[in-house]
């Protein structure tokens, strides 16, 4: 014969549990239904009686089934630096987490942040050693020789030195190497004025084809980010 | 006519050094940056090492960092690549290249090449 | 794996066109550097075909242009020919690396 299913409230056998979704009522002494997330025990179970459930109020939830004769209250709304990503509901609290250039220093244990902070920025000579995250700081490095950042960020890498011809000025740790620009000299009239032109730049190059034979004229590049290097530096 | 010379390849231990050399001619040697660029046998192209025209400034590759020396006497127009701590995976043939003009980030003459061959 | 994606291979019959692709990132090709396209004869050294993205070298045929679009650039050789038939090999600065990048290479085949 096929065992017979118990309904709720019933007394357990001696040694063994309550089903899933059923709780154990020390009162009745018996297995009794827990109440679906988004509600909760308005009446506890009797012998005769089983639990009675209603649903949360308003800014109240509960995320778990359960047997507790109040909802939980969401949190307090989310501050300025923070971005709600998930809503108050009768099933879940509310979750804040922090807005893009911040991170969580301090988290709660629903996965909500607590206390966000700005994330750091690294500063010219310094780039990005560690990106932050949701959870951590940026880790700034001070730009090794040979590569530089001009920029105050905390998303900018520390980048090689741009390959020069000629070098007019050296790069360092917050700038970038200035290069002296080279052209032919048959592409000019005689004492043209040659504008100078960045090396290896983003812009188009309408240069006419090289003629290595001949020896080019130079024109100096300004440097376009911080001051000069101080008296000493030399370029090539 | 430009014309550029490379030297010094040959047979080598893994550990081993090797220096090879560039001679160049047919342009203004010391205006423009120098290149190493090789190329691992039935593989493509690899840039190695730059040196800037008034030999001042030095680039490398991450891959040879620490291992590799590139130099230029503009005296004897002749650019240089001092090769130490040799791996099997440096096995190449070696190219030596100019800077262009404007732009040394592109290459408007190339060498023939040396080849390099790190085995024990 | 390389920095520029170039397809291995590509194909063509004599007088035909054949365009070859060279794909980077935001950091290269995409930050606006110039694409500069080199041709490999057999055994041979390489040599400088294509700078500044669509400027020919002289002695280069006007049969081989390049373009540059976005974060790809491409080669065309039109009027396809035997001696065409090398590998070919696009280039180009990035910002994170101390020199040019390359892309992986592509064996141009003339049939027939």
């Known amino acids: 014969l096929p065992a017979q299913v118990a309904f709720t409230p019933y007394a357990p056998e001696p040694g063994s549990t309550c089903r899933l979704r059923e709780y154990y009522d020390q009162t009745a002494q018996m297995c009794c239904s827990k109440c679906s997330p988004g509600q909760h025990a308005k009446v506890f179970c009797t012998k005769t009686s089983d639990t009675v459930c209603d649903s949360c109020e308003d800014s109240t939830y509960t995320q778990l089934w359960n047997w507790v004769p109040e909802c939980l209250s969401c949190g307090s709304r989310c501050s300025s630096d923070q971005v709600e990503t998930q809503a108050c509901t009768r099933e879940q609290n509310r979750i804040c987490t922090c807005r893009p250039g911040w991170y969580c220093a301090l988290s709660t244990h629903s996965g909500s942040c607590r206390q966000c902070m700005r994330l750091s920025k690294c500063g010219p000579g310094f780039g990005v050693a560690r990106p932050g995250t949701e959870t951590s700081d940026v880790v700034c490095k001070p730009c090794a020789p040979g590569t530089f950042s001009n920029t105050t960020s905390s998303t900018d890498i520390c980048r090689p030195h741009q390959i020069c011809n000629v070098v007019a000025i050296p790069g360092n740790a917050s700038m970038d190497a200035v290069c002296t620009s080279t052209s032919p000299t048959r592409s000019m009239a005689p004492g043209a004025v040659h504008l100078p032109q960045p090396v290896s730049t983003r812009s188009q190059h309408t240069q006419p084809t090289p003629e290595p034979s001949t020896a080019p004229s130079t024109s100096f590049l300004l440097p376009m980010g911080p001051s000069p290097p101080a008296e000493g530096s030399t370029g090539d | 006519e430009v014309q550029l010379l490379e030297s010094g390849g040959g047979l080598v231990q893994p550990g081993g050094s090797l220096r090879l050399s560039c001679a160049a001619s047919?342009?203004?040697?010391?205006?423009?940056?120098m290149h190493w660029v090789r190329q691992a046998p039935g593989k493509g192209l690899e840039w190695v090492s730059a040196?800037?025209?008034?030999?001042?400034?030095?680039y490398y590759a991450d891959s040879v960092k620490g291992r590799f020396t590139i130099s230029r006497d503009n005296s004897k127009n002749t650019l240089y690549l001092q090769m130490n701590s040799l791996r099997a995976e440096d096995t190449a043939v070696y190219y030596c290249a100019k800077g262009g003009t404007g732009d040394p980030y592109y290459f408007d003459y190339w060498g023939q090449g040396t080849l390099v061959t790190v085995s024990s | 794996q390389s920095v520029l994606t170039q397809p291995p291979s590509a194909s063509g019959t004599p007088g035909q066109r054949v365009t070859i692709s060279c794909t980077g990132s935001?950091?290269?090709?995409?930050?606006?550097?110039?694409v500069h396209w080199y041709q490999q004869l057999p055994g041979t050294a390489p040599k400088l075909l294509i700078y500044r993205n669509n400027q020919r070298p002289s002695g280069v045929p006007d049969r081989f242009s390049g373009s540059k679009s976005g974060t790809s650039a491409s080669l065309a050789i039109s009027g396809l020919r035997s001696e065409d038939e090398a590998d070919y090999y696009c280039?180009?600065?990035?910002?994170?690396?101390?020199?040019?990048?390359f892309g992986g290479g592509t064996k141009l085949t003339v049939l027939g």
């Open positions: 280039a180009a600065r990035d910002d994170g690396l101390s020199g040019p990048v």
């Open positions: 047919g342009f203004t040697f010391s205006s423009y940056a």
């Open positions: 935001s950091s290269n090709i995409g930050a606006g550097y110039d």
């Open positions: 040196i800037s025209g008034g030999a001042t400034t030095t």
